[in-house]
């Protein structure tokens, strides 16, 4: 039950995280015009990964896409790449984890396969979250650098083409959304990996050998628990608490009426 809950929660947390990463990637407010200690403007500038926008005091908002690919800073391209990789990995991870969910039965899929898929999706979520956090952090670092450069009257816009001395940019809402979303995806991935350990079936072979002491009906079963080698082992699902203590593999064991588990 705890494993199912951990897996389900990991899935939901990762889902929210990936939705957040997608939202952050699409948002226009990665950097916003710094209003502190600046002249009061009738124009509010903000920029995203794909376009830059202006909100006029008249109420109108106009955005302009970065129609050049080669003219953009390499760092911006790197951030785009990291966010896209994060989204792609996260999306694949979600797809895999849906089939890995313990509460969903697909044909005769064994727990070992589900454990493998859970681990795979968990790793994908972890990498996805790390990509998002890295992307947002690179952009934030770029902003900090440009902020001080612009203070020295050297700042050019994210497009890198037009000299606009008066506009300094600071952290936008998308950065915080990205950090939180990346963190959630990372946490979700860790939870999936933890759930995977619980999903991996433990090879518990109760090989029923009866020793009948005279006058006593005491069953002694050697062997105990065989430690599972993990989610990669070829262990099959063992029915342990069967009336006759038979495993699916050992249909030819002959229990006596004195055998207890």
């Amino acid at each position: 039950m705890a494993v199912t809950a951990c897996q389900g929660l990991g899935f939901v947390v990762s889902l929210i995280g990936i939705a957040g990463i997608i939202a952050a990637t699409c948002m226009d407010q990665w950097s916003t015009q710094d209003l502190y200690n600046n002249p009061v403007t009738a124009v509010f500038n903000y920029q995203g990964l794909w376009r830059s926008c202006v909100r006029e005091s008249s109420g109108f908002t106009e955005c302009r896409g970065y129609f050049t690919l080669l003219g953009l800073p390499a760092m911006l391209q790197a951030v785009r790449a990291l966010m896209i990789v994060g989204i792609v990995l996260g999306a694949i991870g979600l797809l895999v984890s849906i089939f890995a969910l313990k509460c969903i039965r697909i044909g005769s899929m064994e727990d070992s396969a589900k454990a493998n898929m859970t681990l795979t999706s968990g790793i994908m979520f972890i990498v996805s979250g790390l990509c998002a956090i890295a992307g947002v952090s690179v952009f934030a670092n770029m902003l900090v650098t440009n902020f001080w450069m612009s203070t020295a009257n050297m700042y050019t816009g994210m497009g890198g083409m037009v000299q606009t001395v008066q506009t300094r940019y600071t952290f936008g809402a998308a950065l915080f959304v990205g950090w939180v979303a990346g963190g959630l995806t990372l946490i979700g991935g860790v939870m999936m990996c933890i759930a995977c350990r619980g999903l991996a079936p433990e090879e518990t072979n109760y090989k029923a050998v009866s020793y009948h002491a005279s006058g006593h009906s005491v069953a002694y079963k050697p062997g105990g628990f065989k430690a599972s080698t993990g989610f990669g082992s070829n262990t099959k699902n063992k029915k342990i608490y069967d009336g006759g203590a038979r495993t699916e593999d050992e249909v030819q064991s002959y229990p006596s009426k004195h055998d207890y588990v």
Partner: antibody
């Protein structure tokens, strides 16, 4: 047809108060950023104040603390409350709508405010 | 405050001739967000309120004759009337629409030579 009609101007003594109104027809003033611009006799245009969405207001430094821009959405009217009036406030006051590019596209005919003893 | 300086203060041009009015701002009016210049040109005839001619430095207002054109970027802007008509005689103002206060130029009076 969009029309802006200013009223409330007149002769007032220095230190006195006046409230200018700008009534809109064919336009819902509350949905637009609005401005007051003045023009002293024989002089150029001077922006005085603006009110934008959310009721955020901006003022020319020389009128800050003396003038207050506001609007009554129910009456579809823009106001400019002027107090502690000075001789240099004498001008024709226009109300205008801010549009694309923060440019003022619709203007009223203006109302004359004369501050004199 | 941003200072808008128009030149010349007055301009006498023959009908059918080209008229050019310049406007210089003390700070760049170019927005990095949309690459537009926040400068507007107005025409004011005696006894009338101003009329918007050009906004975003070069975008002509609908209904304005195409003999009016605006150009320039950053701090230097120009209003050009390609072929002066009698009805174009007026005072022309440029306005900064980027920074508060939204300052106007001192005006250029256009007259017939």
């Amino acid at each position: 047809e969009v029309q802006l009609v200013e009223s409330g101007g007149g002769l007032v003594q220095p230190g006195g108060s006046l409230r200018l109104s700008c009534a809109g027809s064919g336009i819902t003033l509350s949905t637009y950023a609005m401005s007051w611009v003045r023009q002293a006799p024989g002089k150029g245009l001077e922006w005085v104040s603006s009110i934008i969405s959310g009721g955020i207001t901006y003022y020319l430094d020389s009128v800050k603390g003396r003038f207050t821009i506001s609007r009554d959405n129910a009456k579809n009217t823009l106001y400019l409350q002027m107090s502690s009036l000075r001789a240099e406030d004498t001008a024709v006051y226009y109300c205008a709508r801010k549009y694309h590019g923060n440019a003022l596209d619709y203007w009223g005919q203006g109302t004359l405010v004369t501050v004199s003893s | 405050d941003i200072v808008m300086t128009q030149s010349p203060d007055s301009l006498a041009v023959s009908l059918g001739e080209r008229a050019t009015i310049n406007c210089k701002s003390s700070q760049s009016l170019l927005s990095s967000g949309n690459q537009r210049n926040y400068l507007t040109w107005y025409q004011q005839k005696p006894g009338q309120p101003p009329k918007k001619l050009i906004y975003w430095a070069s975008t002509r207002e609908s209904g304005v004759p195409d003999r009016f054109s605006g150009s320039g970027s950053g701090t230097d802007f120009t209003l050009t009337i390609s072929s002066l008509q009698a009805e174009d005689l007026a005072v022309y103002y440029c306005q900064n629409n980027y920074f508060y206060p939204l300052t106007f130029g001192q005006g250029t009076k256009l007259e017939i030579k």
